[in-house]
């Protein structure tokens, strides 16, 4: 055993930015730190065979399988994958270990399987076996967390039925509004399923796994807060649990809270109360209304009343199926080149949506913000003044919604010209879409002021590049015009731009560009 080399097998995961086939080399990529694969001598095998722990990667992932060999002298090697030999270039690192790598770029089904590395050193021969498989992420789910009361305790349990099992955390905040943003110092996170401290201002539970993060806020009516101008509304689907918390603070304990649904007191077992003294000796009471599995008849106005505070209500609406309500008519905007502008979509949805903004086949992250009227808004400002078509897409498992926006940037035309044997052509992408004039330059008209009235064909907006319209104008050449200079000019309300073309030239041959504002 002492004669055998010390072998270390590692996996390096790369951030994808290129695609290619497996390469047995080092390759410049942004990489995560190497992960040990626990290479060990395979028991009862003929010959010296080391085996690495099975590697499971996502489709399209880029990885490097790497072997580090502590062995004196030179080594030679050969990779074998599905009976094909792949060349192998060992090198030595700073610790003088032999390093052999196999890069797999953009993992596909065909690249999954057993990779065998045969190494020959001056002392011995041995084989290293890597098994690479593709992770079945189709079975992964991430469900929004929900609350349950803990048996025989005044505590809430947060549950998220997700695969892989998620990490569940409570996100607590005792401030109001903006200061309760996720990374604010006012926010406290507790990585546990059970929460006993239920008196806080803002209570959320979040679940996260490989698919991301989903949160649920504990719906709260605070009798010490001024009621919203619009009645708070809570949507739930049939079968989901309902939890509403009513909270009130008073100078002493001489007050009580009650819940009513449509002016009828809630049944015993549908609520529970907790109370505590705050640091300034005032009494805080909270009263939870809960239904473990809602039905259509749980819809209605839930009112929390106090003997010492004005009552407040919330409208609970039970739906059969989730929804996304918003106007899907497309919207067109035109802005100046340096004008600040954001696209905006206002919607009401349940369950909460996942959304993306897309431009030019590129997706951008989508943020959404709840408004006081029960609606939410998503804004997109990162358009960098690029004209074209922008798409907002939202889905929540039950419903899908798509809205199209067109952004036009007001600017002076810029002309591109080209000539062939039979015609001259000019195109421009300015906005508003330009109009065209063609002028002939001759001895009689050295300033190119002679109009060309015939043979001009204008095509407005013939080419749509990601929603960006382009206008073009073509001049069909007559024999009489050959050898002449002509000028095409595009103009709109912001200015004019011209190109001069020598007719009879075989390729793109603009040689003077005028800009007339």
């Amino acid at each position: 055993n002492q004669d055998l080399p010390v072998i270390k097998c590692v996996l390096i995961n790369h951030k994808n930015n290129d695609s290619s086939v497996g390469k047995s080399s080092s390759y410049p990529m942004v990489s995560e730190s190497p992960e040990d694969l626990g290479c060990a001598l395979r028991p009862q095998s003929a010959g010296t065979v080391y085996e690495a722990a099975t590697v499971e990667v996502d489709v399209s992932a880029s990885i490097t399988l790497q072997v580090l060999v502590d062995t004196p002298g030179n080594i030679s090697c050969l990779w074998v994958f599905k009976h094909s030999s792949l060349n192998c270039q060992p090198h030595f690192d700073v610790q003088n270990r032999g390093v052999v790598s196999m890069v797999i770029l953009k993992m596909t089904e065909t690249q999954a399987g057993e990779y065998l590395l045969f190494i020959q050193s001056e002392a011995t021969n041995y084989t290293i076996l890597f098994t690479v498989s593709i992770r079945n992420t189709l079975l992964f789910t991430l469900r929004r967390p929900y609350f349950r009361k803990m048996e025989n305790q005044d505590a809430l349990v947060c549950i998220s039925e997700s695969v892989p099992e998620p990490i569940v955390e409570w996100v607590l905040c005792d401030s109001q509004g903006e200061s309760c943003k996720e990374e604010s110092p006012a926010v406290v996170k507790k990585e546990e399923k059970v929460l006993h401290e239920l008196f806080g201002t803002d209570i959320r539970c979040c679940a996260r796994n490989e698919l991301g993060r989903e949160c649920t806020r504990l719906f709260t009516i605070d009798l010490n807060q001024t009621p919203q101008t619009t009645l708070p509304q809570l949507f739930l689907k049939v079968g989901e649990p309902l939890w509403i918390r009513c909270k009130a603070v008073h100078v002493n304990h001489g007050f009580g809270l009650t819940w009513e649904l449509e002016n009828k007191a809630l049944e015993e077992g549908s609520y529970f109360e907790m109370s505590t003294y705050s640091t300034n000796r005032t009494m805080i009471r909270i009263l939870f209304a809960f239904v473990s599995s809602v039905a259509r008849n749980d819809t209605g106005y839930y009112t929390c009343s106090s003997s010492k505070h004005p009552s407040q209500s919330a409208l609970v609406t039970i739906v059969e199926k989730g929804f996304i309500n918003a106007t899907n008519s497309s919207e067109d905007y035109e802005i100046d080149q340096y004008e600040e502008f954001c696209f905006s979509v206002r919607f009401k949805a349940y369950p909460q949506i996942r959304c993306t903004w897309t431009f030019s086949r590129k997706s951008f992250p989508c943020e959404q913000k709840g408004l006081d009227d029960g609606y939410s808004v998503s804004k997109f400002c990162n358009h960098k003044h690029q004209p074209g078509e922008y798409i907002f897409h939202a889905e929540n498992g039950d419903a899908q919604f798509t809205k199209m926006f067109t952004l036009n940037i007001r600017r002076k035309p810029q002309v591109l010209a080209e000539a062939s044997a039979s015609q001259a052509s000019c195109s421009s992408d300015g906005y508003p879409l330009p109009s065209w004039t063609w002028k002939k330059c001759s001895d009689k008209s050295p300033n190119c002021t002679e109009d060309i009235p015939e043979g001009v064909w204008n095509r407005k907006a013939n080419r749509k590049v990601f929603g960006q319209w382009v206008s073009s104008s073509t001049l069909n050449m007559s024999e009489a015009m050959k050898g002449f200079l002509v000028k095409c000019c595009a103009y709109n309300s912001l200015g004019t731009s011209c190109e001069t073309i020598l007719l009879n030239s075989p390729g793109p041959f603009p040689f003077i560009q005028d800009s007339i504002s």
């Epitope: 996996l11 995961n13 992960e35 040990d36 694969l37 626990g38 060990a40 395979r42 028991p43 009862q44 085996e51 690495a52 722990a53 099975t54 590697v55 499971e56 990667v57 990885i63 057993e114 076996l129 098994t131 695969v163 892989p164 099992e165 490989e210």
Partner: antibody
Framework: QVTLKESGPTLVKPTETLTLTCTFS??????????VSWIRQPPGKCLEWLAH???????SYSTSLKSRLTISKDTSKSQVVLTLTNMDPVDTATYFC????????????????WGQGTMVTVSS | DIQMTQSPSSLSASVGDRVTITCRAS??????LAWYQQKPGKAPKRLIY???SLQSGVPSRFSGSGSGTEFTLTISSLQPEDFATYYC?????????FGCGTKLEIK
């Protein structure tokens, strides 16, 4: 270099819940099929296996302690967490976490690397 | 659950001695057995896996044998650093189970 390090309270009161964290580096439970187990050893006594979590999130627990144990992992933080409820003085022990690679040909090398252990005392 | 019975529970020996420790499984575990060495205040260290495969970096005086239900760990010539407690572990099926250890002391 592969390391595992246990952390958590050194003193716990009876009936309380113990939460221990195993933070590891040099390997991951995201891409390689690996598992992490918790093992404990009361002073001067035998090693006792408690729970195991696989990279695919499957779990296995000691028969005698199943009702009190929960094991979970946070792949992004390279952590495995063990909770043991309703602690009793007999749960006083050094708690270890250890890694177990899984090989495609079906054999296993058991625990190849261990953490240094953390001593937990249960006392009122 | 599979029970692992380790014997002897303690053993006195001298440097240079040949020592054998036995582990018996209550049912067939094929060769899914590992041997660990533990020194006071330290974590266990793997010596043997898959019943007979020597851990990389472990001296060749350590060897393992057996299959099914009977397993042995042999130290061919004891060295001063070998005085420690040795444990067997079956990892054939969950729950995993350890033997209760053999304490190897200097005679």
């Amino acid at each position: 270099q592969v390391t595992l390090k246990e952390s958590g309270p050194t003193l716990v009161k009876p009936t309380e819940t113990l939460t221990l964290t195993c933070t590891f580096s040099g390997f991951s439970l995201r891409y390689a099929r690996m598992g992490v187990s918790w093992i404990r050893q009361p002073p001067g006594k035998c090693l006792e296996w408690l729970a195991h979590i696989f990279s695919n999130d499957e779990k296995s627990y000691s028969t005698s302690l199943k009702s009190r144990l929960t094991i979970s992992k946070d792949t992004s933080k390279s952590q495995v967490v063990l909770t043991l409820t309703n602690m009793d003085p007999v749960d006083t022990a050094t708690y270890f976490c250890a890694r177990m690679p899984e090989y495609s040909s079906g054999w296993s090398g058991a625990f190849d690397i261990w953490g240094q252990g953390t001593m937990v005392t249960v006392s009122s | 659950d599979i029970q692992m019975t380790q014997s002897p529970s303690s053993l006195s020996a001298s440097v240079g001695d040949r020592v054998t420790i036995t582990c018996r499984a209550s049912q067939d575990i094929r060769n899914d057995l590992a041997w660990y060495q533990q020194k006071p205040g330290k974590a266990p260290k793997r010596l043997i896996y898959a019943a007979s495969s020597l851990q990389s970096g472990v001296p060749s005086r350590f060897s393992g044998s057996g299959s099914g239900t009977e397993f042995t760990l042999t130290i061919s010539s004891l060295q001063p650093e070998d005085f420690a407690t040795y444990y067997c572990l079956q990892h054939n099926s969950y729950p995993l189970t350890f033997g209760c250890g053999t304490k190897l002391e200097i005679k």
